[in-house]
Amino acid sequence: QKSSIEKCSVDIQQSRNKTTERPGLLNCPIYWQQLREKCLLFSHTVNPWNNSLADCSTKESSLLLIRDKDELIHTQNLIRDKAILFWIGLNFSLSEKNWKWINGSFLNSNDLEIRGDAKENSCISISQTSVYSEYCSTEIRWICQKELTPVRNKVYPDS
């Protein structure tokens, strides 16, 4: 039995997979910040986790996925104040009793040191210094990401 948050996450991911391939993103759009091979958008408003997830989807992006501790630190360095929390694309899967990224993969326990409980209706936020489990209904800011894709030169046949 999937929770409503899990269903929402899966639905958005599936609809993204169904869309046709878009051309590779060479540069970050206006207002987005480049962090290595990603473009990040830090929201200025607040939302529960579900709405944040949906907002990123409408921007043809996803809630932030963090690969490792190094990426976490570099992202945290972009947060301007200690009293700001941002949702990322990680929440507790009740069915699998584990932290699950919105791309379907599970959290490697070495990647993030989460402060707080792993339980139903828990979603992950990050601050300047830490990673927190917060209730998914809490209204805080969020971070969307777009992948920058290296575009190979296409060779066209002579016309």
């Epitope: 200025h44 607040v46 301007r80 104040d81 200690k82 009293a83 700001i84 929390l85 402060r115 707080g116 409980d117 828990s122 601050s127 830490s130 927190y132 489990s133 917060e134 209730y135 209904s137 809490t138 209204e139 805080i140």
Partner: antibody, heavy 119, light 107 residues
Framework: EVQLVESGGGLVQPGGSLRLSCAAS????????MSWVRQAPGKGLEWVSA????????YYADSVKGRFTISRDNSKNTLYLQMNSLRAEDTAVYYC????????????WGQGTLVTVSS | DIQMTQSPSSLSASVGDRVTITCRAS??????LNWYQQKPGKAPRFLIY???SLQSGVPSRFSGSGSGTDFTLTISSLQPEDFATYYC?????????FGQGTKVEIK
């Protein structure tokens, strides 16, 4: 209806301790950051401390850092402020307020509890 | 820390008057400014958020404007229940700071 009710204030000697409580009702307590804000007699408002909805994240004004500790018990819908090493300048009405993480405003306030630090 | 400076510190006005209170931040705070009303012996009441958005239940005679460093609270037609002290507050960065207050008194 949102309600915040503070208790625990009183007269305490300099160097003493006190614990304030704030009982919350009328909203999903665990989904909101909470703060303590104080007001010295005849003076303006001063933010003291804030805590995230889960209680995992806290922060403090420099004037109370290392002396005051904010905490919460979401099972009891209660916010706390443990005040140690109290000074005369801590004398104030202490309000609990909903909000405190940027860009939250303090949208609901308790009625306040008076803390007097005097020998 | 961001300093918030209100002016005037106090003012005298009559019922029906248009009243304007200004709040200046020591650095740009975008639109992260809130206004509160406080009556003697009472807790503050939240009036306006994000510089110009009226909190639910607050009468429409209250309005806010401004962005960056300069902000204004306007009461279009002062009512007897509006005599109080008004505070601005920034939620751009920590520590959260308030203005020193503006006391609106009866002329």
């Amino acid at each position: 209806e949102v309600q915040l009710v503070e208790s625990g204030g009183g007269l305490v000697q300099p160097g003493g301790s006190l614990r304030l409580s704030c009982a919350a009702s009328g909203f999903t307590f665990s989904s909101y950051a909470m703060s303590w804000v104080r007001q010295a007699p005849g003076k303006g408002l001063e933010w003291v401390s804030a805590i995230s909805g889960s209680g995992g994240s806290t922060y403090y004004a420099d004037s109370v850092k290392g002396r005051f500790t904010i905490s919460r018990d979401n099972s009891k819908n209660t916010l706390y402020l443990q005040m140690n090493s109290l000074r005369a300048e801590d004398t104030a009405v202490y309000y609990c307020a909903r909000g405190g993480y940027l860009p939250d405003a303090f949208d609901y306030w308790g009625q306040g509890t008076l803390v007097t630090v005097s020998s | 820390d961001i300093q918030m400076t209100q002016s005037p510190s106090s003012l005298s006005a009559s019922v029906g008057d248009r009243v304007t209170i200004t709040c200046r931040a020591s650095q740009s705070i975008s639109s992260y400014l809130n206004w509160y009303q406080q009556k003697p012996g009472k807790a503050p009441r939240f009036l306006i958020y994000a510089a110009s958005s009226l909190q639910s239940g607050v009468p429409s005679r209250f309005s806010g404007s401004g962005s960056g460093t300069d902000f204004t609270l306007t009461i279009s037609s002062l009512q007897p229940e509006d005599f109080a002290t008004y505070y601005c507050q920034q939620t751009y960065s920590t520590p959260l700071t308030f203005g020193q207050g503006t006391k609106v008194e009866i002329k």
